[in-house]
Interface confidence: low
């Protein structure tokens, strides 16, 4: 029931750190595997409209009490459930409040109108760098640089789950100028807003900007990868960076296309298609196994763009850690 789940610390009741009630006690939810499908169910349960983001729970003040329990380590919803309680859940001991899940819903009761339905960074290398675009009524719009600040960039990066905003002088690629309507100018963010839509701005659609003034934002992409244990940077056991922690990748479904994407992303030429024996010479990793069942088409520029199971979900041991050997 709605009384068994709530969002805490947000600007309105439809955003914040996720808390659930068990046996009369409120506790947090760990963000292992937490994604937009889980948020969609939560928003539905709370009567908060559609999901709009999966921000980190630590963004919301006041933070969880140190003694407050993490009651659920991972939630796995298909997105069709009516309540979070209907989703697969695991309660385990090994989750800290640094990993509390957060949620942001559209909030149909909100005073601002209309409510844009999303934000993205377009035409960049990955989803954490690019031209700022916002979605409204199934149409993407660009944002004018007039009045834009690093504070506004912080909000975008947070909303996209892309870490901190990076100060950049980069302008939009002239060959990739927005051909869309210009949505907003005079964005006035404090930097603490959960979404760009929460920032005060000039009147919607009324501005004198042109696409030369489209806003470009770069965030500190939290995803990175490396090859360790080899003779050079282009060979070794594959490790990916997630939530500031390096972890390995399971070899289930791993093949030539996945090799090629890794080599491409690292600027290491082409895969040398190593044998099973060669792959095993770098030994097993330790710590987290972050990814499993990675599926690439081979066209991706980053492993992050390939399909995979939720972060941290796997049925592997470190004996199955992927290793990659590129031409260098």
């Amino acid at each position: 029931s709605p009384s068994g789940v709530r969002l805490v610390g947000g600007l309105h009741r439809c955003e914040g750190r996720v808390e659930v009630e068990q046996k009369g006690q409120w506790g947090t939810v760990c963000d292992d595997g937490w994604d937009i499908k889980d948020v969609a169910v939560l928003c539905r349960e709370l009567g908060c409209g559609a999901a709009s983001g999966t921000p980190s729970g630590i963004l919301y003040e006041p933070p969880a009490e140190k003694e407050q329990k993490v009651l659920i380590q991972s939630v796995s919803c298909t997105g069709t459930e009516d309540t979070l309680a209907q989703c697969e859940q695991e309660e385990v001991y090994d989750c800290s409040h640094d990993e509390d899940a957060g949620a942001s819903c559209e909030n149909p009761e909100s005073s601002f109108s209309p409510v844009p339905e999303g934000v993205r960074l377009a035409d960049g290398p990955g989803h954490c760098k690019g031209r700022v675009e916002v979605k409204h009524q199934n149409q993407w719009y660009t944002v004018c640089q007039t009045g834009w600040s690093l504070r506004a960039a912080k909000v975008v990066c947070r909303q996209l789950g892309c870490g901190r905003a990076v100060l950049t002088q980069k302008r939009c690629n002239k060959h990739a100028y927005g051909r869309k309507p210009i949505w907003l100018s005079q964005m006035s963010c404090s930097g603490r807003e959960a979404t760009l839509q929460d920032c005060p701005s000039g009147p919607w659609g009324k501005n004198t900007c042109n696409h030369d003034e489209d806003t470009w934002v770069e965030c500190e992409d939290p995803f990175d990868l490396r090859l360790v244990g080899g003779d050079n940077l282009c060979s070794g056991r594959l490790e990916v960076l997630h939530k500031g922690v390096w972890g390995s990748v399971c070899d289930d479904n791993w093949g030539e296309k996945e090799d090629q994407v890794v080599c491409k992303q690292l600027g290491c030429g082409k895969s040398l298609s190593p044998s099973f024996r060669d792959r095993k010479c770098y030994g097993p990793g330790v710590g987290r196994i972050w990814l499993d069942n990675v599926r690439c088409s081979g066209e991706e520029q980053s492993l992050e763009q390939c399909q995979h199971r939720f972060w941290g979900f796997h049925d592997c041991t470190h004996q199955e850690d992927v290793a990659v050997i590129c031409s260098g």
């Epitope: 140190k66 385990v92 090994d94 800290s96 922690v245 196994i289 941290g312």
Partner: antibody
């Protein structure tokens, strides 16, 4: 709720040895399990943990020397290449950040030629 | 890697007296500290968990306190049976400490 270790015996140096911890009354899907050892006359020494996901984490000194694995009701500790310094009583224990810590009685491993 | 520094290494006190043992963590472990008592030839006996919660059957003469990085075990009204070695252990797991459930070095308590 209980845990019980087994498999401790006398082996020669270099002979791999696997110890087993059998749990009852709780689930390894909701609890991690650790291995700890104590050499004769020495203090308690933490080896490593297997968490619910099956991920394993080892003390720095133990990495490469031990392997922890599990089934639905047992947790194994493999001593990959024992030396005489690995002679000790080995305990398995459920950590207790949210729940009450739970220990077994221990199993004695002797490494001698 | 997370370290627990336990002091003193040994202490001697009279029956009826009080002993205080300290345990310092190298990083924040919140309330995730456990205290054990061990006598020769026996497995460790749980005294205190979650820093201050008394385990079942343990007399209230044993008191745990602290949180974060500083913890204390106080044994008052000492009895002869309290002669043993006492250990603290971290029971807070996180990726930042690589799930290292480390022990302190132990404190040997002698009763005069």
């Amino acid at each position: 709720q209980s845990v019980k270790e087994s498999g401790g015996r006398l082996v020669t140096p270099g002979t791999p040895l696997t110890l087993t911890c059998t749990v009852s009354g709780f689930y390894l899907s909701t609890h991690g399990m650790t291995w700890v050892r104590q050499a004769p006359g020495k203090g308690l020494e933490y080896i490593g943990v297997i968490v619910t996901s099956g991920n394993t984490y080892y003390a720095t000194w133990a990495t490469g020397r031990f392997t922890i694995s599990k089934t639905s009701t047992t947790v194994d500790l493999k001593i990959t290449s024992p030396t005489t310094e690995d002679t000790a009583t080995y305990f398995c224990a459920r950590p207790g950040y949210k729940s009450v810590p739970l220990w077994g009685q221990g199993t004695l491993v002797t490494i001698s030629s | 890697e997370l370290d627990l520094t336990q002091t003193p290494a040994s202490v001697s006190a009279a029956v009826g007296g009080t002993v205080t043992i300290n345990c310092q963590a190298s990083e924040d472990i919140y309330s995730g500290l456990t205290w054990y008592q061990q006598k020769p030839g026996q497995p460790p006996k749980l005294l205190i968990y979650r820093a201050s919660t008394l385990a079942s059957g343990v007399p209230p003469r044993f008191k745990g306190s602290g949180s974060g990085t500083e913890f204390t075990l106080t044994i008052s009204d000492l009895e002869c049976d309290d002669a043993a070695t006492y250990y603290c252990q971290n029971n807070y797991g996180s990726s930042s400490n690589n799930y290292v459930f480390a022990f302190g070095g132990g404190t040997e308590v002698e009763i005069k």
